[in-house]
């Protein structure tokens, strides 16, 4: 009998007749940048402080009639979803509201910037516990709004935003496109993407995860005891802001990178029907629906990784695409993907003192994506070892030769346009797990890392007959850090990680003969950290 | 209209005490860029966020804003500084004619300028 959205985000062990997970986010302050709110609504009375900040444009239209309950509608509902006593996610969280949207739900980039600056100044004047900022709004792509979000995030603030309700690529909107912000799309009770009239939730690589966002019951500004159902990516973002408040209350020292990784890790996987998304966006859109962790403590032992897709390189011959990890994350592997199959591989390279993943387009190619595997690996020391093209029949190989370094990922990059179309494939010799092997005309890059207690192993799955997709997954307790294809023959479109599964995609089988060249092997590198596990046990 | 005239009078008085000799000197190095919303109906021309380079201090932001006002006034344009940013990004929010963008992009410390645009509840 609890609202569907609260049930959906609640792990089974909490699912009694009531929604009462432990610790309701009481150590966290959530800032809401939205419309005005009805602060004396019984859902939020006493837990939402209305700041004196207001920066809104005039309402459009000469005959616009300002009605308080309408002005407060959006903000009141969201405050209720985040921290409402009876229909909220983080029932213990305290909130502060800033008015940046007018009675028609419209604001400006400049007003939002001034609001974010107000939060930063408040944080400096009176430092409190962890801060979450909810931005349930969207405008067109804005360099300055994204930059302000980046600065605030780097000051230790967790920003959560709506992906947008435009049934479009979230990367075309701000603050949804800001990499430092946690961007949330909306799903319904059937775990399907939300349709809103002719539009619906945004999607794409700029979305971090989805959350309930259709028919969400929450505080209505119509009366102090009223509830109403609202839909949108704002409601979805409010759920994630509430979940973030709960997680930060349980573990106040969590960094933004750690929080994002946990949100991804504890999400429900592969429940969204991807057919709703445009075909070219399906591979880029995370199939994740947010949920509370089953236990608020003890997640620290896991090695958390996520997949970050680059923007599309564009079709020019020398075009490249770059995928980057967050400042606190380690790039443990790099792969590439091209729908046309015409690519020249990928490589890990240093940029501004940090490793990035760069993919290379090939002549006649429609463009490539770089795919970074970004992980939380404390005290890690990672480097890239490169072997130039070998020209030997056995192919190119490179291994981690430094003492204590383990292989976390393999990349290969080639200059020739059609690698492997007329060359026999190479196979990696057995019993040599710490090395990368590739085509003799490719340079091979091994990601080698040293971190306390880090151990990795290679897992392969080969299919002799051609198939559009070959997968290999890491078993329970192990985390996928590297994903690549063997051999690097021309019909392989690329490789990428989806959660803990390595996916190697090939051209449509009808275009590929079932010769030995049709054989495709997916190679996963699976790692775990004994050090993190021990540290966690000692804490408990 | 009366309000604008009042602002203009204040501005002229401020200019008399402004050290204006350096106003024309463009900063050497990379050229600042201009950005605007790709979705035309969401654009708000006439209001601009002038973003200054990362290490710019508040005093320099204020000086740059005053310099823009001084140069604009000499060309017969009224400008209004709506807000000076500091704490997150250095810069200022200015209400001005789009005709002044070229001038503003040449000001010292300017990294880029973005035309204001609308955001919407989702």
């Amino acid at each position: 009998s609890i609202p569907w959205n609260l049930e959906r985000i609640t792990p089974p062990r909490y699912r009694a007749d009531e929604y009462q997970p432990p610790d309701g986010g009481s150590l966290v302050e959530v800032y809401l940048l939205d419309t005005s709110i009805q602060s004396d609504h019984r859902e939020i009375e006493g837990r939402v402080m209305v700041t004196d900040f207001e920066n809104v444009p005039e309402e459009d239209g000469t005959r616009f009639h300002r009605q308080a309950s309408k002005c407060d509608s959006h903000g009141t509902h969201l405050a209720g979803v985040v921290s409402g006593r009876d229909a909220g996610v983080a029932k213990g969280a305290s909130m502060r509201s800033l008015r940046v949207l007018n009675c028609q739900g419209k604001g400006t980039v400049s007003g939002t910037l001034i609001g974010l600056e107000f939060i930063r100044k408040s944080q400096l004047v009176q430092p409190v516990g962890p801060l979450v900022v909810l931005l349930p709004l969207a405008g067109g792509y804005s360099r300055v709004l994204n930059a302000a979000c980046q600065r605030l995030a780097r000051a230790g603030v967790v920003l959560v935003t709506a992906a947008g309700n435009f049934r479009d690529d979230a990367c075309l909107y701000s603050p949804a496109s800001a990499p430092e912000v946690i961007t949330v799309g909306a799903t319904n009770a059937q775990d399907q993407p939300v349709t809103l009239g002719t539009l619906g939730t945004n999607f794409g690589r700029c979305v971090d995860l989805f959350a309930p966002g259709e028919d969400i019951i929450g505080a209505s500004s119509d009366c102090s005891t009223c509830f109403v159902s609202q839909s949108g990516t704002s409601q979805a973002a409010a759920h994630v802001a509430g979940i973030a408040a709960m997680m930060l209350s349980a573990e106040p020292e969590l960094t933004l990178a750690e929080l994002r990784q946990r949100l991804i890790h504890f999400s429900a996987k592969d429940v969204i029907n991807e057919a709703w998304f445009p075909e070219d966006q399906r591979v880029l859109t995370p199939n994740l629906v947010a949920a509370l962790p089953p236990s608020t403590h003890g997640a620290g032992w896991q090695l958390f990784c996520r997949t970050v897709w680059s923007a599309h390189s564009g079709p020019t011959r020398m075009a490249t695409a770059v995928a980057r990890c967050a400042p606190d994350e380690e790039l443990l592997s790099c792969s590439s993907f091209s729908r046309s199959g015409k690519r020249r591989g990928e490589r890990m390279e240093a940029q501004g003192g940090k490793l990035v993943c760069r993919a290379h387009n090939a002549f006649g190619g429609e463009g490539v994506y770089a795919i970074a595997r970004c992980c939380l690996l404390p005290q890690a020391n990672c480097s890239v070892h490169t072997a130039p093209p070998a020209e030997a029949s056995m192919g190119t190989r490179v291994h981690c030769h430094q003492q204590g370094h383990v292989l976390t990922g393999c990349s290969s990059h080639w200059e020739v346009e059609d690698l492997g179309t007329h060359k026999p494939p190479v196979l990696r010799p057995r019993g040599q797990p710490n090395q990368c092997v590739g085509h003799r005309e490719a340079s091979i890059h091994a990601s080698c890392c040293h971190a306390p207690g880090l151990e990795c192993k290679v897992k392969e799955h080969g299919i002799p007959a051609p198939q559009e997709q070959v997968t290999v997954a890491c078993e329970e307790g192990w985390t996928l850090t590297g994903c690549s294809a063997l051999p690097g023959t021309s019909h392989v479109l690329g490789a990428y990680a989806v959660d803990n599964t390595c996916v190697v995609r090939s051209r449509d089988v009808s275009t590929t003969g079932s010769t030995s060249e049709g054989a495709v092997t997916a190679v996963a590198i699976c790692c775990r950290s004994r050090h993190l596990a021990q540290a966690s046990q000692e804490l408990q | 209209q009366e309000d604008e005239d009042g602002d203009y009078e204040e501005l002229v008085l401020a200019l008399r005490s402004e050290e204006d000799g350096l106003a024309e000197a463009p900063e050497h190095g990379t050229t600042a860029t201009f950005h605007r919303c790709a979705k035309d109906p969401w654009r708000l021309p006439g209001t601009y966020v002038v973003v200054l380079k990362e290490e710019t201090h508040l005093s320099q932001s204020e000086r740059t804003a005053r310099r823009l006002q001084a140069q604009a006034a000499r060309r017969g344009y009224l400008t209004k500084i709506l807000h000076v940013f500091h704490g997150l990004l250095p810069g200022f929010l200015v209400k001005m004619s789009g005709d002044l963008l070229e001038l503003a992009l040449k000001l010292p410390h300017v990294d880029y300028i973005e035309e204001d645009s609308s955001v919407f509840a989702q």
Epitope: I2, E18, D40, D222, S224, T225 | -
Partner: antibody
């Protein structure tokens, strides 16, 4: 069908704490569809809402009585209780308990007080 | 707080007559108003909610109207069991009740 029954002492001394319990039968107090409220009526006068509680323990009080009121719930006994401290003769009234539709589950029906208990008279006197 | 003023305080009518009771709010309560009937020695009973909706089991002779600040409860033809005290209640801003209108036999 759902029934509510108030119980507690009919006489309380001034400055003491008034304590009443409402027992719910014919339905579960642990439903997210309802709040459970207390309303009082001084002899010959009108009705005054005291406060309400949700199964989770969330409470809402009349601002004029907030400093003196505590409402609690015991889901295992299907009961909710009222405590009113530092009573005076002005607190003499018939005290009613009632169910209120929560609105959290929209299908639950109107968000008003229905049904009510039959009421219990509490006299504050030394 | 929102104050509800009921008028008249007492209404003396005969069975079969039409009764019109008024409730005025000190500020708009939209349509968030209910009417209750209370007979001597009994608890109040919900008659009308959200200004015009009849509660379950309430006869059709009871009807409510109004929105904003002015509301009316109408009993089209009084039955002997309808003689009682009637209260209005708002929930626009928490809960307050009116002072009541006593409908007595003339």
């Amino acid at each position: 069908q759902l029934q509510l029954q108030e119980s507690g002492p009919g006489l309380v001394k001034p400055s003491e704490t008034l304590s009443l319990t409402c027992t719910v039968s014919g339905g579960s107090i642990s439903s997210s569809s309802y709040y459970w409220g207390w309303i009082r009526q001084p002899p010959g006068k009108g009705l005054e809402w005291i406060g309400s509680i949700y199964y989770s323990g969330s409470t809402y009080y009349n601002p004029s009585l907030k400093s003196r009121v505590t409402i609690s719930v015991d889901t295992s006994k299907n009961q909710f209780s009222l405590k009113l401290s530092s009573v005076t003769a002005a607190d003499t009234a018939v005290y009613y308990c009632a169910r209120e539709g929560s609105g959290v589950v929209p299908a639950a029906g109107p968000n008003w007080f229905d049904p009510w208990g039959q009421g219990t008279l509490v006299t504050v006197s030394s | 707080e929102i104050v509800l003023t009921q008028s008249p305080a007492t209404l003396s009518l005969s069975p079969g007559e039409r009764a019109t009771l008024s409730c005025r709010a000190s500020q708009s309560v939209s349509s968030y108003l209910a009417w209750y009937q209370q007979k001597p020695g009994q608890a109040p009973r919900l008659l009308i909610y959200d200004a015009s909706n009849r509660a379950t089991g309430i006869p059709a002779r009871f009807s409510g109207s109004g929105s904003g600040t002015d509301f009316t409860l109408t009993i089209s033809s009084l039955e002997p069991e309808d003689f009682a005290v009637y209260y209005c209640q708002q929930r626009r801003n928490w809960f307050t009740f009116g002072g009541g209108t006593k409908v007595e036999i003339k």
